[in-house]
């Protein structure tokens, strides 16, 4: 066992001479992003104060390619890198095409409305006049491709004029536009060469040891890894922690059960019920508030102040009133919970599916005519599953090196 341990320690660290270095640099696992949209069935009725009705559409599946660049080894046992992602639509795996039309809330209009609720009435009336002149409405009918990767919207210019410096978009707006052909920030992580216990743990993200999106030191901490590999020799007492730039926070998953993936022993880690709980149910999350109902996390502070919320799909594990407020939601543990299956000896993921939902808080705002009589509601926009499983040559090599060889050596 000590020989095996030495082999593992030698080969998991981030070092060009280690077996897993190329795997770390160019992840050989095929990743897929499956997106499900909530098509709004009754936009006119919602504007009259009726309950929203949605229909899930999808999946729209994209192959996700990741590669690390600007890899720089530092002299404090860390390595810095940028990871770029590109997405390629997969028609054969999708239920529909990128040219499918979806009716969804106009995030720019409804988001701006909620953001301006406490602004002077004059500004709100000017916005109403502008929205009317520009033909901006509370709901929009856009293609999947436009919603994902961006569409030209004059409102982007308007928001940049009236709220300078707040909006990360220029000319075009898309929910996944910032992810495609771009990096998720500069990660500096420990290599494990000098101290294996810190391997893969994030030292800094974009030069920061902690973020400032939230209202408590604990919530602002950058904990765990960058979300791709973890320290080796896990036990059922281990937790799986990582910093997610998209969620602007660290997340901690808990051990659920042992399993086997293609002959390789794994530990399954899942989200605890407290992941998106509000501060009154789980006090450590108080720093993520102001909160609405439990089970959704307000990400407005890191999403250009728009009233956007992150949760499990279909408001799984959230306060039931959220799913009850929208017709067409059916939370289901099997379909909507996330998991990561990790090989505990190496800390390398074998099979994973991270599922999250993005929702918009919308309501009628006095002075913004486009909001009509909308009753306050957290309306799901879409949910996605980012999934990957080790396969082919990589899986064969992994099985041989880390399952077969140790068995042979053991005998």
């Amino acid at each position: 066992p000590s020989l095996i341990k030495q082999q593992v320690l030698k080969n998991v660290r981030i070092d060009p001479s280690s077996l897993s270095f190329n795997m770390w640099k160019e992840i050989p696992i095929p990743f897929y992003l499956s997106v499900y949209f909530f098509d709004v069935m009754n936009p006119s009725e919602i504007l009259k104060g009726e309950k929203p009705q949605v229909r899930e559409r999808g999946p729209y599946v994209y192959r996700e390619f990741r590669h690390k660049s600007n890899i720089t080894f530092n002299n404090n046992d860390t390595v810095s890198f940028l990871e770029y992602r590109t997405f390629q639509f997969q028609p054969s795996k999708s239920h529909g095409s990128e040219s499918d039309y979806i009716v969804m809330p106009n995030i720019l209009v409804l988001g701006a409305a909620v953001m301006m609720e406490n602004k002077p009435m004059t500004l709100k009336l000017i916005m109403t006049l502008a929205f009317t002149t520009l033909g901006e409405r509370a709901f929009m009918n856009r293609t999947v491709g436009e919603i994902m990767w961006g569409y030209k919207d004059p409102l982007v210019n308007l928001i940049n004029k009236y709220f300078p410096g707040m909006f990360p978009f220029k000319d075009k707006f898309g929910l996944f536009a910032e992810l495609n052909n771009s990096d998720s920030g500069l990660f500096t992580v420990f290599t494990g060469v000098q101290n294996i216990s810190r391997i893969h743990l994030v030292d800094k993200w974009n030069g920061l040891s902690k973020v400032d999106f939230w209202h408590s030191d604990q919530c602002n901490m950058i904990n765990g890894t960058s979300g791709q590999m973890w320290p080796p020799f896990m036990t059922p007492e281990s937790s799986l922690e990582f910093y997610s730039p998209e969620a602007c926070r660290s997340m901690k998953l808990m051990y659920k059960e042992s399993g086997v993936f293609e002959g390789i022993p794994t530990y399954r880690f899942v989200a605890p019920k407290t992941l998106f709980a509000n501060g009154s149910i789980y006090p450590p999350n108080e720093g993520f508030c102001p909160c609405l109902e439990s089970g959704i996390q307000n990400v407005s502070t890191c999403r250009f102040s728009a009233p956007l919320f992150l949760s499990h799909p279909h408001f799984l594990n959230a306060d039931p009133v959220l799913a009850e407020a929208v017709t067409g939601l059916h939370p289901n543990q099997e379909a909507h919970s996330l998991f990561l299956d990790i090989h505990p000896v190496t800390g390398i993921p074998m099979n994973c599916s991270v599922k999250l939902q993005l929702s918009l808080y919308m309501k009628s705002v006095a002075g913004i005519g486009q909001t009509g009589k909308i009753e306050p509601v957290v309306l799901p926009l879409l949910w996605f599953a980012e999934s990957g499983a080790m396969e082919g040559e990589t899986l064969h090599t992994f099985y041989t090196q880390l399952v077969l060889m140790p068995k042979v050596m053991h005998y």
């Epitope: 009336l125 009317t132 210019n157 308007l158």
Partner: antibody, heavy 119, light 110 residues
Amino acid sequence: EVQLVQSGAEVRKPGTAVKISCKVAGDTFTDYFIYWLQQAPGKGPEWMGLIDPKDAQTIYAEKFQGRVAITADTSTDTAYMELSSLKSEDTAVYYCATDSVGSAGFDVWGQGTLVTVSS
Amino acid sequence: LPVLTQPPSASGAPGQRVTFSCSGSGSNIGSYTVNWYQQLPGAAPRLLMHTTDQRASGVPDRFSGSKSGTSASLAITGLQSEDEADYFCAAWDDSLDGPVFGGGTKLTVL
């Protein structure tokens, strides 16, 4: 479907004021913002101001600021536009308009009210 | 003077194609979408096109709109006698914090 019905033509002397009405029919008055526009002979329309009848909040174009007052009476489903200190250049057709919820641009207009300012 | 500039007149024979131009600046057409209104003689303006290239409800597909830089245009194909009217362009202007209109183009169907 919402319709806007305006009051009849008016003749005024310079320095006086005129008050035009715009009645909303066919739907709930307070669901619609009412916009007022001026169209001088042979020219394009010019936006003057707007009102949210729900809470009587208004804004006015800089050009008309101080001379125009837009009001609403929810008991009669009617919006009003009063223009004071009239000048001969104010001779024009005045329109109320709205945007039906979920539409774009000013897609519903009143028939217009001709105001002639002459000594 | 109107903020948006339109030629005062245009003409065409029935069945022909006519185009109206509307010139603005970076604070209006250059940054935002354009609406077009049709005003028949003695009537109120009627919304014809919104968000540059979208026809308003009930408008036939003979009408089309486009925009390039700080100019916009409206085209009518298969000209008909009932198209004889004034045509106004309009856009949001962020230096004036309001909508601005062109002076209008009078279309005569020959």
